[in-house]
Amino acid sequence: CKAMHVAQPAVVLASSRGIASFVCEYASPGKATEVRVTVLRQADSQVTEVCAATYMMGNELTFLDDSICTGTSSGNQVNLTIQGLRAMDTGLYICKVELMYPPPYYLGIGNGTQIYVIDPEPCPDSDF
């Protein structure tokens, strides 16, 4: 079977600063030199793209400057960080990996990571 398997953690809790990190690991059926990683958010049956980056194997992956994601790659493993999260962003975040080059193309979709985001309590007013 030449399908591509993608593994990611089931649950992650965002930090109080609204930052969540998780590892997306894929078992490559081919020798890809160009890989695209996309983070998707699934809410109900709607799927939206959160961020995407293409990288050459052996190089760092680079998200667009205005992206809420950052990441590093090592072999078939990508460490993803999503920032600026708020409680309303709690949901299922799916790691999608595509082997873009050389042909053939392969698609891999993880089962998703449920990211829980809790907004920090506002600081109480002080008289100082």
């Epitope: 399908a3 591509m4 059926p29 998707l40 799927v47 979709i109």
Partner: antibody, heavy 118, light 108 residues
């Protein structure tokens, strides 16, 4: 709402060329892989080619490799298929198709008929 | 290349009956990458099922998909008059993306 509208089909002689276009609207074009799928009269569906995202990566069916070129212009939200050295067996309705974020083919144009005949 | 085979080629049934369509792959296909499409004469195909079992937007719940590995099934629980059409399975996990030859569901 998502719309895909093909144009450029017609009758052409064997060995000649034709260029199909597909105007897309209602979605962020550059975030999606775009495909051409064809259907010969009375036959099933055959995937032809795909162009990904920024247009740098393309994949083709063996039956059209070296003769057809898929491309896209993200600034115009338009997909193209340049068809050279056409053969009688290329006669088909050609559909422009969006590959959704999870990979399946979720939106199809109405199709444009290409007839290769002398 | 993954070759998909569909059976039966034609299924003759009456409205209200249950339709069971089969799709078999030449090698294992992850269920995440198997779709079903419906096509009526003179129309473009329409996505019914993706990921082997998830209904596309707006698809009635009488349509359901199942299966894994090399064997997949599309079931229409009670055929409505508008369901008589040709149904194609497809794998989209690797290129070349391939379709089955189709199953025609016609009125008995």
């Amino acid at each position: 709402q998502v719309q895909l509208v093909e144009s450029g089909g017609g009758v052409v002689q064997p060995g000649r060329s034709l260029r199909l276009s597909c105007a897309a609207s209602g979605f962020t074009f550059s975030s999606y892989g775009m495909h051409w799928v064809r259907q010969a009269p009375g036959k099933g569906l055959e995937w032809v080619a795909v162009v990904w995202y920024d247009g740098n990566n393309k994949h083709y069916a063996d039956s059209v490799k070296g003769r057809f070129t898929i491309s896209r212009d993200n600034s115009k939200n338009t997909l193209y298929l340049q068809m050279n050295s056409l053969r009688a067996e290329d006669t088909a309705v050609y559909y422009c198709v969006r590959g959704d974020l999870l990979g399946s083919f979720d939106y199809w144009g109405q199709g444009t008929l290409v007839t290769v005949s002398s | 290349e993954i070759v998909l085979t569909q059976s039966p080629g034609t299924l003759s049934l009456s409205p209200g009956e249950r339709a069971t369509l089969s799709c078999r792959a030449s090698q294992s296909v992850s269920s995440s990458y198997l779709a079903w499409y419906q096509q009526k004469p003179g129309q473009a195909p329409r996505l019914l099922i993706y990921g082997a079992s998830s209904r596309a937007t707006g698809i009635p719940d009488r349509f359901s998909g199942s299966g894994s590995g090399t064997d997949f099934t599309l079931t229409i629980s009670r055929l409505e008059p508008e369901d008589f059409a040709v149904y194609y399975c497809q794998q989209y996990g690797s290129s070349p993306f391939t379709f089955g030859p189709g199953t025609k569901v016609d009125i008995k």
